[in-house]
């Protein structure tokens, strides 16, 4: 978790002098509770926006927006703490809006925005806006939270962001898999425009089951420049196991920008259709 272009952060608007500060996510009002505290934010909204860095890189950012309730507690509102918690790592990043002037009621509802939290593809975040000072231990909560899931690199708009392109999102291998005679699979895919090796990972499963009955790894050496964007064809030999008929083929590239953490593409071959007619029951039952 990080902020995009930290030096450009502003929160001032007409009628309010405000500054954005780094926060430890532990506001002083937790330790020294105040008697009078503001009400909670109203109508917290989160959207995915895209922002360029000064270097020209494009990153997904969380655009956070909220409004104030129209009650007298804005007289005691000293600012807001914005917190983004990445749910799978428990990493948290906070910033603080510090109001340098008192808020006054005016003809339209106060609205605040912040669009500088960089988010990662396919990650879920808990976004919280806490009004400051925070409430006394038994006081009514004065925060609003939402869980926000960022699209993965398969998403058309995410595909062209720097983190996705770095992990190989622009490569479309267009995998085809066909079953051949004599327990073989023919795998075909389009090579990318980089002289890097690939790995084909084959995992086979019984029909309707999820524990594998066969695994195989096949190494494909780095192509020469004249082979870029060409189809690579590989024939894999399967284990002759009855019922081990559903095959998942995964292609792992090793591009220089993502090494062994590149996006993988996969294709699945289903088991052949079973005939609907029931097996004939024999006229006699053997006794042994």
């Amino acid at each position: 978790l990080r902020l995009l272009d930290h030096r450009a952060l502003v929160c001032s608007q007409p009628g309010l002098n405000c500054t954005v500060k780094n926060s430890t996510c532990l506001d002083d009002s937790w330790i020294h509770p105040r008697n009078l505290t503001p009400s909670s934010p109203k109508d917290l909204q989160i959207q995915l926006h895209f922002a360029h860095t000064q270097q020209g890189d494009l990153f997904p950012v969380a655009h956070i927006e909220w409004t104030l309730q129209t009650d007298a507690s804005i007289l005691y509102l000293e600012g807001a703490e914005l917190s983004v918690l990445q749910l799978n790592t428990n990493e948290r990043l906070c910033v603080r809006f510090e109001f340098l002037s008192k808020l006054r009621h005016h003809h339209r509802r106060w609205r605040f925005t912040f669009s500088h939290f960089v988010v990662d593809p396919d990650q879920e975040y808990e976004v919280t806006v806490h009004h400051l000072p925070k409430p006394i231990p038994d006081g009514d909560p004065n925060h609003q939270s939402k869980n926000f899931l960022v699209p993965d690199c398969e998403h058309a708009r995410m595909k062209v962001t720097t983190p996705c392109m770095s992990s190989g999102s622009l490569w479309d291998p267009n995998i085809t898999v066909e079953t051949l005679e004599a327990h073989q699979l023919r795998v075909s895919f389009t090579l990318w425009n980089e002289s890097t090796h690939y790995q084909i990972l084959l995992t086979s499963f019984p029909h309707m089951e999820n524990h594998s009955c066969f695994e195989h790894m096949h190494h494909i050496p780095a192509p020469r420049p004249e082979e870029f964007h060409q189809r690579s064809n590989v024939t894999l030999t399967l284990r002759n196991l009855k019922g081990c008929c559903r095959h998942q083929v995964q292609i792992q590239p090793f591009f220089s920008s993502c090494l062994n953490d590149c996006l993988r593409h996969s294709a699945t071959v289903s088991c052949p259709e079973m005939p609907d007619t029931p097996e004939p029951i024999p006229d006699y039952m053997p006794l042994w």
């Epitope: 989160i46 959207q47 927006e65 939402k146 869980n147 926000f148 899931l149 699209p151 998403h155 058309a156």
Partner: nanobody
Framework: EVQLVESGGGLVQPGRSLRLSCAAS????????MHWVRQAPGKGLEWVSG????????DYADSVKGRFTISRDNAKNSLYLQMNSLRVEDTALYYC???????????????????RGQGTLVTVSS
């Protein structure tokens, strides 16, 4: 112009099933998360269920969990709600709604819904 057209509502007895459909047009359907919301007679809007752009995430209101299933077909620009074990309290006008921005929020959308259809009426009565 964004258009969302719901269908599939009707009068049904408690315990029976219905399948609602929503045909979407005027925007890139598979870019956006979608939701179902409902409005019971004389009540406000209630979020029912949501699904992410690629069907990777689905969430449900506690009142419908285990009974309703949300799904989508991006190739057909369509959203669905399979409603089983219907109850009298499920009676409402059901709306299909588009998430305003990209991304997905469980439990009611990331921001105010910018578009919804005209709704389809579900009446559960014996």
């Amino acid at each position: 112009e964004v258009q969302l057209v719901e269908s599939g509502g009707g009068l049904v007895q408690p315990g029976r099933s219905l399948r609602l459909s929503c045909a979407a047009s005027g925007f890139t359907f598979d870019d956006y998360a979608m939701h179902w919301v409902r409005q019971a007679p004389g009540k406000g809007l209630e979020w029912v269920s949501g699904i992410s752009w690629n069907s990777g995430r689905r969430d449900y209101a506690d009142s419908v969990k285990g009974r309703f299933t949300i799904s989508r077909d991006n190739a057909k620009n369509s959203l669905y709600l399979q409603m089983n074990s219907l109850r009298v309290e499920d009676t409402a006008l059901y709306y299909c709604v588009k998430e305003t921005g990209l991304g997905y929020c469980s439990g009611g959308g990331c921001s105010d819904f910018d578009y919804r259809g005209q709704g389809t009426l579900v009446t559960v009565s014996s």
